[in-house]
Amino acid sequence: APFDDDDKIVGGYNCEENSVPYQVSLNSGYHFCGGSLINEQWVVSAGHCYKSRIQVRLGEHNIEVLEGNEQFINAAKIIRHPQYDRKTLNNDIMLIKLSSRAVINARVSTISLPTAPPATGTKCLISGWGNTASSGADYPDELQCLDAPVLSQAKCEASYPGKITSNMFCVGFLEGGKDSCQGDSGGPVVCNGQLQGVVSWGDGCAQKNKPGVYTKVYNYVKWIKNTIAANS
């Protein structure tokens, strides 16, 4: 594989322990998706990460070892966006209400929703426990991080003709080598301290001219706030 020498996320690095305190792991007997804690009782993830039963794991770094900072809380409500489209992955966003409030501390804390859409060129942090190999399987135990820029909508649409909606944007590198991958879905893209993206899809991982595609959280702030208010 062209980019699998010490690849992390693909091409990232080991996050400093608990340096991404809003990152959660969604577990159904194994880690299947990421998510972001947006308040004490609600998590944002991807619509395609829907399962009828989910355990939300907060304060994780090594997901295979109990390190003492974890909080495991079952999902009480799982609300996929009403216009989620499985075929196109448009509206690929979901809210999870925790069955009890998370305890906020230095290792578990919330991330702010965006106040403006993501600007081209902005450097963002993507994180997750997804596959670190661009071909084959190498799933890490420890949380991986990747710094990557927001790409212009024109470059995004040119990479995926006819597939990019106004609810999606691209982050990454057209030269390949650095990207989110399988297992990172639902996880955060944080730019300037705001949750701008949710890991959604892409053609393969870290392939040339095939950057990662992310749900544009800014378009859903009203839906998120209304849904939380209606289910509190």
Epitope: F32, H48, N131, Y139, S180, Q182, G183, V199, G212
Partner: antibody, heavy 125, light 107 residues
């Protein structure tokens, strides 16, 4: 409860086709995929292919490409497997099994948690 | 394609014995392995998923371990209803492949 119920046993002549059905109940059909697995008499398990119940995306075993077609009918929560140009070595018990979807950048886990009871297909002249 | 090699192909054991079955993948599959039990004339039944997670309703005497290429299914204390054939399956990528099976027989 979650279950998959398959159609009854079939006896076919070489060169004919067979279509096996698998009716799902107890869960949301379109949230999962269906795999088809067969087992020849006294032999092990052989994966035939996979179909997404929501998008009808398919992935077939290479040795069966061109002879097998998997479909779904979401209105009746039923999956179908058609095998054409039957040969004697297609004699087997055919199983459908529920698996996870492969979508976006979700963890790919292709295990099968619920199985149908099996359909015996005998190919004989 | 990823080849799955199971060993032994058969094992004779007595009630109460500890039985270990191994499965080796021809390339790394991380934790994406499942174990099934099959009794004559019946459909396979999922025992273990994601290498070590016990399927709901399966007795705790069954356990799984391993990651990468080498995996193990252990029955800590064999019971009469455990005499069956056991299969591993790589769940990492298409085409899905199974091991050849291990038949656990009464000694």
């Amino acid at each position: 409860q979650v279950q998959l119920v398959q159609s009854g046993a079939e006896v076919k002549k070489p060169g004919a086709s067979v279509k096996v059905s698998c009716k799902a109940s107890g869960y949301t059909f379109t949230d999962y995929a269906i795999s088809w697995v067969r087992q020849a008499p006294g032999q092990g398990l052989e994966w035939m292919g996979w179909i997404s119940a929501s998008t009808a995306d398919t992935n077939y075993a290479q040795k069966l490409q061109g002879r097998v077609t998997m479909t779904t009918d979401t209105s009746t929560s039923t999956a179908y497997m058609e095998l054409r140009s039957l040969r004697s070595d297609d004699t087997a018990v055919y199983y459908c099994a529920r698996g996870t979807e492969v979508v976006g950048k979700m963890t790919v886990y292709l295990g099968m948690d619920v199985w149908g009871q099996g359909t015996t297909v005998t190919v004989s002249s | 394609d990823i080849q799955m090699t199971q060993s032994p192909s058969s094992v004779s054991a007595s009630v109460g014995d500890r039985v270990t079955i191994t499965c080796r993948a021809s390339q790394g599959i991380s934790r994406w392995l499942a174990w099934y039990q099959q009794k004559p004339g019946k459909a396979p039944k999922l025992l273990i998923y994601a290498a070590s997670s016990l399927q709901s309703g399966v007795p705790s005497r069954f356990s799984g371990s391993g990651s990468g290429t080498d995996f193990t299914l252990t029955i800590s204390s064999l019971q009469p209803e455990d005499f069956a054939t056991y299969y591993c399956q790589q769940a990492n990528s298409f085409p899905i492949t199974f091991g050849g099976g291990t038949k656990v027989e009464i000694k």
